[in-house]
């Protein structure tokens, strides 16, 4: 977890004199507890926005938007911490909106929003705009919670963003797989336009069952620069094993931005299909 | 312009089956994780379940886990909710939304964010 361009960070709006500052997640008001506290955020949304470094990358980021209720709290209300937990790892990160100048009321209702909170590819995030000052401990709560589920390098947006592309994304490698004669398996799949190795992941199932029957690894050597974009062709021999006839086929890249942590792509052949068979009728009648 | 066309309601007998269906136009489909969400007679709007752009993840309400189940047609631009073992109190319009942001908002944290586009379809359990 961080935040995108961190001095490019402000809260500041008409009538209102705010800063951003970096926050422990521990605000001052949980230890020392104040007598009058605002009220909860209202109509807290998190979208999924994508914003571009100074450096052209693109990166996914979390964009939070909240108003505040329309009561005199406001009176009492001295900024706003968000927090991004990140829900696999708890990691937490958190920032302070300090508001330098007193709230008043006006002819709309108030609206704040940040658009820092770089966000992960296929992670889930619980994002939490809680007002300071933070209640007392029996207080009603003032904070706003919600979950957010980022796509991952598949979904066409977060595709072209940079960890995403650093990951591989761009790459189809089309893969085909058929099966021949003699217990083997033909994969055909379209080079990258890089000169880097890859790998074949065989891994073959019973019918109706997930426990692998046979596994198989096939190294495929850096191609050449006329090589690229064209088509592999390997064929691979399985064990000769009844039933054991679903086969998924994987191919692990290793290209230079990603190593051995690149997206891989796979395919899967099924069994083939049983036909049924009737019981034959006989065509004579047994006496006995 | 969003457009969500819900289908498949009626009247059952409690313990009988339902499927529900939706279908959209007005907006890439199969970048968008979509929920179904409900209202009893009387009441507010309830979540029911969600589903994410892919089908890779999926959310239900706690009280209809294993009762209901979602899933979605992206070349066909449908989502569906199939509904068995129904109960009275499972009597509301249903609604399909799509989630307000190309991620997911998930655990139906984001019912108060939902909008609301089609006209529903009337789901009635009663004997």
């Known amino acids: 977890l961080r935040l995108l361009d961190h001095r490019a960070l402000v809260c500041s709006q008409p009538g209102l004199n705010c800063t951003v500052k970096n926050s422990t997640c521990l605000d001052d008001s949980w230890i020392h507890p104040r007598n009058l506290t605002p009220s909860s955020p209202k109509d807290l949304q998190i979208q999924l926005h994508f914003a571009h470094t100074q450096q052209g990358d693109l990166f996914p980021v979390a964009h939070i938007e909240w108003t505040l209720q329309t009561d005199a709290s406001i009176l009492y209300l001295e900024g706003a911490e968000l927090s991004v937990l990140q829900l696999n790892t708890n990691e937490r990160l958190c920032v302070r909106f300090e508001f330098l100048s007193k709230l008043r009321h006006h002819h709309r209702r108030w609206r704040f929003t940040f658009s820092h909170f770089v966000v992960d590819p296929d992670q889930e995030y619980e994002v939490t705009v809680h007002h300071l000052p933070k209640p007392i401990p029996d207080g009603d709560p003032n904070h706003q919670s919600k979950n957010f589920l980022v796509p991952d390098c598949e979904h066409a947006r977060m595709k072209v963003t940079t960890p995403c592309m650093s990951s591989g994304s761009l790459w189809d490698p089309n893969i085909t797989v058929e099966t021949l004669e003699a217990h083997q398996l033909r994969v055909s799949f379209t080079l990258w336009n890089e000169s880097t190795h890859y790998q074949i992941l065989l891994t073959s199932f019973p019918h109706m069952e997930n426990h692998s029957c046979f596994e198989h690894m096939h190294h495929i050597p850096a191609p050449r620069p006329e090589e690229f974009h064209q088509r592999s062709n390997v064929t691979l021999t399985l064990r000769n094993l009844k039933g054991c006839c679903r086969h998924q086929v994987q191919i692990q890249p290793f290209f230079s931005s990603c190593l051995n942590d690149c997206l891989r792509h796979s395919a899967t052949v099924s069994c083939p299909e049983m036909p049924d068979t009737p019981e034959p009728i006989p065509d004579y009648m047994p006496l006995w | 312009e969003v457009q969500l066309v819900e289908s498949g309601g009626g009247l059952v007998q409690p313990g009988r089956s339902l499927r529900l269906s939706c279908a959209a136009s007005?907006?890439?489909?199969?970048?968008?994780?979509m929920h179904w969400v409900r209202q009893p007679p009387g009441k507010g709007l309830e979540w029911v379940s969600g589903?994410?752009?892919?089908?890779?993840?999926?959310d239900y309400a706690d009280s209809l886990k294993g009762r209901f189940t979602i899933s979605r047609d992206n070349a066909n631009n449908s989502l569906y909710l199939q509904m068995n073992s129904l109960r009275a109190e499972d009597t509301a319009m249903y609604y399909c939304?799509?989630?307000?942001?190309?991620?997911?908002?998930?655990?139906?944290?984001?019912?108060?964010?939902?909008?609301?586009r089609g006209q529903g379809t009337m789901v009635t359990v009663s004997s």
């Open positions: 007005g907006f890439t489909f199969g970048d968008y994780a």
């Open positions: 589903i994410s752009w892919n089908g890779g993840r999926i």
């Open positions: 939304v799509k989630d307000p942001s190309l991620g997911y908002c998930s655990g139906g944290t984001c019912s108060d964010s939902f909008d609301i």
